[in-house]
Interface confidence: low
């Protein structure tokens, strides 16, 4: 038991400390008082605290706790924030390069297709970017639209260059024929599979990182309960009321208080562990057709192969399409 | 095969590499992130202990405060919480998490389920044919030799893959703040909360 304060004891030390905490306020007793109105720092004898001081201590204790929590999560928070930003930018760079590679392939191999091809390729990769960022676009529709748009240009510029390229009638017929006749063989299906799988995984990876940020932000900005505030005040500040300015809380006592204050937060632990391990599993599986870097940067080659496939079947296709779209062509020549 | 479009449309600045010791791909980046994240796997269970170790606690002193009185650091009284007749620590724990914490737990459950679904190896075996062969038979018209297949990865491998460090403005080993200029640069310094209280400890 600490000895009771000597009769000449004043609250000078407590006063000067409290003044720094709350400048200009005269809430500190000159000399120790009974403190019968105190609700948190219940005195065993005369005390240098008043009810107002107690309130200020509670406020400060909760603020300290919030700051300590933010300090604790700072490194983790920046790790995830930063990676989310880096990966988002990196994915955009992959998309940009994939578009550039595809455009370069058209420019070098099929210069006559370039103006329109560039446009269709650009639209396709814009959709890819939007999908990664969470847009509600269907990947199969994106791929179909790319090939539907490309085929009329390939037909009019490469397979049948004598046709005028201005009329829309034949274009609509050619778009339909593209699917009915499987003009590009199985390449569109191959691209759909690869692109949809790699983009799906990429999208969920980014979603998971963004949720990680949300988790940390949530716990970072928790407001602690009044009960917790009282416990923290007793631990950190009630000793001051007895003039014990230099004494620190016992370690075991601190752990008990913190476990009480953070009981709710600690419940996240199980799901947080599972989150990291599930994310690890996802990352370990992000290769081959599940790796968008691999898939998108090779798309130019697959698209080139698909056009070569059309070229190799051009004779048969021209005859079939000539019959199929004859009505549209006649209307054009009139 | 297609004319390899190297250098044609790629910004020249991409190729200016700052201190990259090896070819960095996104996959190595992802693995690096997971390794770093795994060091935080016990983050939430360790929080109470972390906060105690980063706030003033008696370490070398003989005496310490137990909420009611000054006691010897290793005595029975030191671990007592000094809260009897005030508010029950057990009650505080029984209240359960705040609604905002419950919400975030639900979101975590949902994303964990999604992540597990996406990682399911069973689902992948079914795709393997498409991935490796590229085509089902009979899909290529009359001449089977016209089938241009997606062997291996179903595509030509792009040389070196991208050296992403060269393009990105920041590298995770030499990282600056997130894209948001409002944010501070990362560091894990303890915010000196108690310094605000007049350096009493």
């Amino acid at each position: 038991q600490p000895p009771p304060p000597p009769p000449d004891a004043t609250c000078h030390q407590v006063r000067s400390f409290f003044q720094r905490l709350q400048p200009g306020l005269k809430w500190v007793p000159e000399t120790p008082v009974p403190g019968s109105d105190l609700q948190v720092c219940l005195p065993k004898g005369p005390t240098c605290c008043s009810r107002k001081m107690e309130e200020k201590y509670q406020l400060t204790a909760r603020l300290n706790m919030e700051q300590l929590l933010q300090s604790a999560s700072m490194e983790l928070k920046f790790l995830i924030i930063q990676n989310a930003a880096v990966f988002q930018e990196a994915f955009e760079i992959v998309v940009r390069h994939a578009k550039n590679y595809t455009n370069a392939m058209f420019k070098n191999n099929y210069p006559s297709l370039t103006p329109q091809a560039f446009e269709f390729v650009g639209e396709f990769f814009t959709d890819v970017s939007l999908y990664i960022l969470g847009s509600d676009i269907n990947v199969d529709d994106m791929v179909n639209e790319l090939f539907d748009s490309l085929f009329p240009v390939i037909y009019t510029q490469l397979m049948n260059p004598g046709l005028p390229d201005s009329a829309l009638d034949i274009n609509e017929c050619l778009r339909g024929a593209r699917r009915d006749l499987k003009v590009f063989g199985n390449f569109p299906k191959l691209i759909m599979t690869q692109v949809s799988k790699s983009l799906q995984v990429t999208r969920i990876f980014l979603q998971a990182l963004n949720l990680g940020i949300e988790v940390i932000n949530t716990t970072d900005h928790l407001k602690f309960s009044k009960d917790c505030g009282r416990m923290l005040t007793r631990m950190w500040y009630c000793s001051y009321c007895q003039g014990l300015m230099m004494v620190k809380p016992c370690g075991g006592y601190c752990n008990v208080v913190m476990q009480g204050c953070m009981a709710g937060v600690v419940e996240i632990d199980k799901y947080w562990r599972e989150y990291i391990l599930s994310l690890e599993e996802l990352v370990n599986g992000m290769y081959r057709i599940y790796d968008m870097e691999n898939v998108l940067l090779g798309l130019f080659s697959t698209i080139h192969d698909s056009i070569q496939y059309v070229q190799k079947n051009a004779g048969k296709l021209t005859t079939t399409i000539g019959k199929l779209c004859a009505h549209s062509q006649q209307r054009q020549y009139r | 095969s297609a004319y390899y479009p190297e250098d044609l449309f790629i910004d020249k600045k991409v190729l200016k590499v700052a201190h990259v010791e090896h070819e960095e791909t996104l996959s190595s980046r992802r693995r690096e992130l997971i390794q770093k994240l795994k060091s935080f796997i016990s983050f939430y269970s360790a929080l109470p202990g972390y906060i105690c170790s980063h706030s003033p606690v008696a370490e070398n002193d003989t005496l310490c405060w137990n909420g009611q009185e000054l006691v010897e650091r290793y005595s029975q009284k030191a671990a007592r919480n000094g809260m009897k007749n005030q508010f029950n620590l057990h009650e505080l724990k029984m209240k359960g998490p705040e609604p905002v914490v419950s919400q975030i737990i639900d979101k975590l459950k949902h994303i964990n389920q999604l992540l597990r679904t996406m990682s399911m190896p069973k689902g992948r075996v079914l795709d393997k044919n498409l991935d490796e062969e590229g085509f089902e038979s009979g899909d290529c018209g009359d001449d089977e030799d016209e089938c241009i297949g997606g062997s291996g990865d179903g595509m030509i491998k792009v040389k070196n893959q991208l050296r992403f460090l060269a393009e990105l403005a920041y590298d995770l080993d030499v990282d600056d703040a997130p894209g948001n200029s409002q944010q501070a640069t990362p560091k894990d310094n303890e915010i000196s909360t108690f310094h605000n209280l007049g350096n009493v400890h």
């Epitope: 490194e75 | 990282d175 600056d176 200029s181 560091k187 894990d188 310094n189 303890e190 000196s192 310094h195």
Partner: antibody
Framework: EVQLVESGGGLVQPGGSLRLSCAAS????????MNWVRQAPGKGLEWVSY????????YYADSVKGRFTISRDNAQNSLYLQMNSLRDEDTAVYYC?????????????WGQGTMVTVSS | DIQLTQSPSFLSASVGDRVTITCRAS??????LAWYQQEPGKAPKLLIY???TLQSGVPSRFSGSGSGTEFTLTITSLQPEDFATYYC?????????FGQGTKVEIK
């Protein structure tokens, strides 16, 4: 009194190694990130390296990456800089500096510096 | 890397003068800029951080302003102890970089 004291400087040949130490006192060393900054004779300041309080996050300037290693021992209140493959251009006064504890970074406490001379 | 360019590099002034030093960043650094003072043979001393926040113990004649890419350090009434070299530093992104310095000499 808050203080940082560097030691370990001296004359070393190109290609050689040196280990600098920085002893901290008067503050909770384990709660602060720490930096090394150097200043070549008659020149300006150049940031060299940073370590977070837990050593989980470490950064280097391009000019020293792969040659210098920053480390710390929180139990000993000490910061270190292991310098290998030293070059003439590494000749400088090396300061250790504390990273401020607030939201915004700044080097609020500096040591007096230790001179490193690389010469054959 | 972000380059910081201070101007002027040398400045001659008299006691009581108002002095302004400019620091330009090669790209936007928001408000992540600090100013240091270094006397010959001594370690640098932090004057201002976060563009305009005065470090405790630094006289109020020192002030900082700016944002983005253009920043200034102002000494309203130069005192004898202010003759020194001043450096700006960006802390927006790694590697952290310093300006080349501005030497304030007695006229």
């Amino acid at each position: 009194e808050v203080q940082l004291v560097e030691s370990g400087g001296g004359l070393v040949q190109p290609g050689g190694s040196l280990r600098l130490s920085c002893a901290a006192s008067g503050f909770t060393f384990s709660g602060f990130g720490m930096n090394w900054v150097r200043q070549a004779p008659g020149k300006g300041l150049e940031w060299v390296s940073y370590t977070s309080s837990s050593s989980r996050t470490i950064y280097y300037a391009d000019s020293v990456k792969g040659r210098f290693t920053i480390s710390r021992d929180n139990a000993q209140n000490s910061l270190y800089l292991q310098m290998n493959s030293l070059r003439d251009e590494d000749t400088a006064v090396y300061y250790c500096a504390r990273d401020s504890s607030g939201w915004y970074d700044a080097f609020d406490i500096w040591g007096q510096g230790t001179m490193v001379t690389v010469s054959s | 890397d972000i380059q910081l360019t201070q101007s002027p590099s040398f400045l001659s002034a008299s006691v009581g003068d108002r002095v302004t030093i400019t620091c330009r960043a090669s790209q936007d650094i928001s408000s992540y800029l600090a100013w240091y003072q270094q006397e010959p043979g001594k370690a640098p001393k932090l004057l201002i951080y976060a563009t305009s926040t005065l470090q405790s113990g630094v006289p109020s004649r020192f002030s900082g302003s700016g944002s983005g890419t253009e920043f200034t350090l102002t000494i309203t009434s130069l005192q004898p102890e202010d003759f020194a070299t001043y450096y700006c530093q960006q802390l927006n992104s790694y590697p952290w970089t310093f300006g080349q310095g501005t030497k304030v000499e007695i006229k």
